[in-house]
């Protein structure tokens, strides 16, 4: 008889999840010489150990510590790029500006990017049918806790001037409930981080408004300043031109504004 399986509101584990994680790990360690020492089988075992056989609404940051330990990596000062609700552009940027790094350019972020996973209490099976939804089911689910854990660590290790890309097309450009607003902002270390520079990315439509004056940006500035970190803000009025000018900084059109 088929076993009864908990039905969650979210989509199930990404198909071929173990193979995908292992393959990504191998690829990453091949491309990044400083991570060649990493044993990908151990990484997968630690990943699996964080959620397999556990009730998927009761996952803790502690569950991911063995994985975090194996994936320890440092970003040079001034080279951390955080983002909120504008992942694609942030990734396009670091693909061009190769010396800057988002969380997804690091091993653990790279392994899990765009994937979903969960297990079941007391079985070694992965649940491919459904996983808990953050809103409808629970916040302490395997995926949410993973991102909270690695985001916290990523912010804690940042130093120098930290950059963050924010989506100017959202009603809340800075959202206190986003991972950036609820985790990363509060885990930047004032003794290591001199400043946070926000880049507010305007939508495709042309606009002259200074979105750095938005009330939510003022709220971000207040939070950051209270933590004794300086705050700067820049409008990126033309994201397409911005990327083009990162690729070809000597282009004559890049002397005028972006």
């Amino acid at each position: 008889l088929p076993r009864w399986r908990q039905q969650w509101s979210g989509s199930g584990t990404t198909s071929r999840f173990p193979e995908t994680v292992l393959a990504r790990c191998v690829k990453y360690t091949e491309v990044h010489p400083e991570m060649r020492h990493v044993d990908c089988q151990s990484v997968w075992d630690a990943f699996k150990g964080a959620f397999i056989s556990k009730y998927p609404c009761n996952i803790t940051e502690e569950d991911y510590q063995p994985l975090v330990k194996l994936g320890t990596q440092t970003v040079p000062c001034n080279k951390t790029l955080l983002w909120s609700r504008i992942k694609d552009l942030a990734h396009q940027f670091t693909q061009v500006q190769r010396d800057m790094f988002t969380l997804e350019d690091m091993l653990l972020g790279y392994l899990a990017d765009d994937l979903t996973w969960c297990g079941e209490f007391n079985t070694f099976e992965i649940n491919y049918q459904s996983c808990p939804d953050w809103r409808k089911d629970c916040s302490n689910n395997p995926v949410s806790v993973f991102w909270k854990t690695v985001s916290r660590r990523f912010a804690e290790t940042a130093c120098g001037v930290v950059h963050v890309m924010l989506n100017g097309s959202r009603s809340k450009i800075f959202d206190k409930n986003s991972t950036f607003g609820s985790v990363e902002v509060h885990n930047l270390q004032p003794e290591k981080v001199q400043a946070l520079e926000a880049w507010v990315i305007h939508g495709g439509r042309e606009d002259s408004r200074d979105l750095c004056q938005d009330p939510t940006i003022k709220e971000l500035e207040s939070i950051i300043s209270k933590r004794n970190i300086r705050f700067f803000c820049k409008n990126i009025y033309r994201p397409d031109k911005f990327l083009q000018c990162v690729k070809n900084p000597e282009d004559s059109s890049c002397l005028s504004g972006i």
Epitope: D207, S208, G257, I258
Partner: antibody, heavy 119, light 112 residues
Framework: QVQLQQSVSELRSPGSSVKLSCKDF?????????MSWVRQKPGHGFEWIGD????????FYGEKFEDKAKLDADTVSNTAYLELTSLSSEDSAIYYC???????????WGQGTLVAVSA | DIVMTQTPLSLPVGLGDQASISCRSS???????????LHWYLQKPGQSPKLLIY???NRFSGVPDRFSGSGSGTDFTLKISRVEAEDLGVYFC?????????FGGGTKLEIK
């Protein structure tokens, strides 16, 4: 053709409030275009009150109007609203709504609503 | 706020003549995105303003080519090459480079 249709003239007494409406007949463009409100007082020229981006409710106010005006928009009826509070004779003017044609350029203007404040 | 100063206040012209209106801003209107947001409007008696020229020199749709705009930084000019009767009214310049957006005091174009 008429694109922005504003409410009729309003006569108000000092200290009261008034809510003006501006219906946009281009339902495709309305949600994603900033709608500005501008007032024209005889001998004072035009003053920009503020604007709203209806789909996300983002609002900018001219500093002078932050405590005077309240902007709002309804994307179901494609209507923008301007509420003026604590009216005085100084607020007597023609109030225009104006939608962007391109980014940050007021291309399409309503016919205006005359607000007269008098005891 | 940016102050927009228009000259002259009144401009009497003959039909078929050229007319020229000047607009000066209290600070540069060159925006950090590379554009200059200086625009010209015409308001006829009893009507709402109509956009003529946007971003210094671009004619808005349906605007005749006898209207042209030029300038940069803080100094701008609207030219009407051959004035027609339907061109009479008050011309306003406006800037939307910096909030709050501001308007010139207007130039009344009238028949000589």
């Amino acid at each position: 053709q008429v694109q922005l249709q504003q409410s009729v003239s309003e006569l108000r007494s000092p200290g009261s409030s008034v809510k003006l409406s501006c219906k946009d007949f281009d339902s495709e463009v309305f949600p994603t275009s900033y709608m500005s409100w501008v007032r024209q007082k005889p001998g004072h020229g035009f003053e920009w009150i503020g604007d709203i981006l209806p789909n996300i409710g983002r609002i900018f106010y001219g500093e002078k109007f932050e405590d005077k005006a309240k902007l709002d928009a309804d994307t179901v009826s494609n209507t923008a609203y301007l509420e003026l509070t604590s009216l005085s004779s100084e607020d007597s003017a023609i109030y225009y709504c104006a939608r962007e044609a391109y980014g940050s350029i007021l291309g399409y203007w309503g016919q205006g609503t005359l607000v007269a404040v008098s005891a | 706020d940016i102050v927009m100063t228009q000259t002259p206040l009144s401009l009497p012209v003959g039909l078929g003549d050229q007319a020229s209106i000047s607009c000066r801003s209290s600070q540069s209107l060159l925006h950090s995105n590379g554009n200059t947001y200086l625009h010209w409007y015409l308001q006829k008696p009893g009507q709402s303003p109509k956009l003529l020229i946007y971003k210094v020199s671009n004619r808005f749709s349906g605007v005749p080519d006898r209207f042209s705009g030029s300038g940069s930084g803080t100094d701008f000019t609207l030219k009407i090459s051959r004035v027609e009767a339907e061109d009479l009214g008050v011309y306003f310049c406006s800037q939307s480079s910096h909030l709050p957006w501001t308007f010139g005091g207007g130039t009344k174009l009238e028949i000589k």
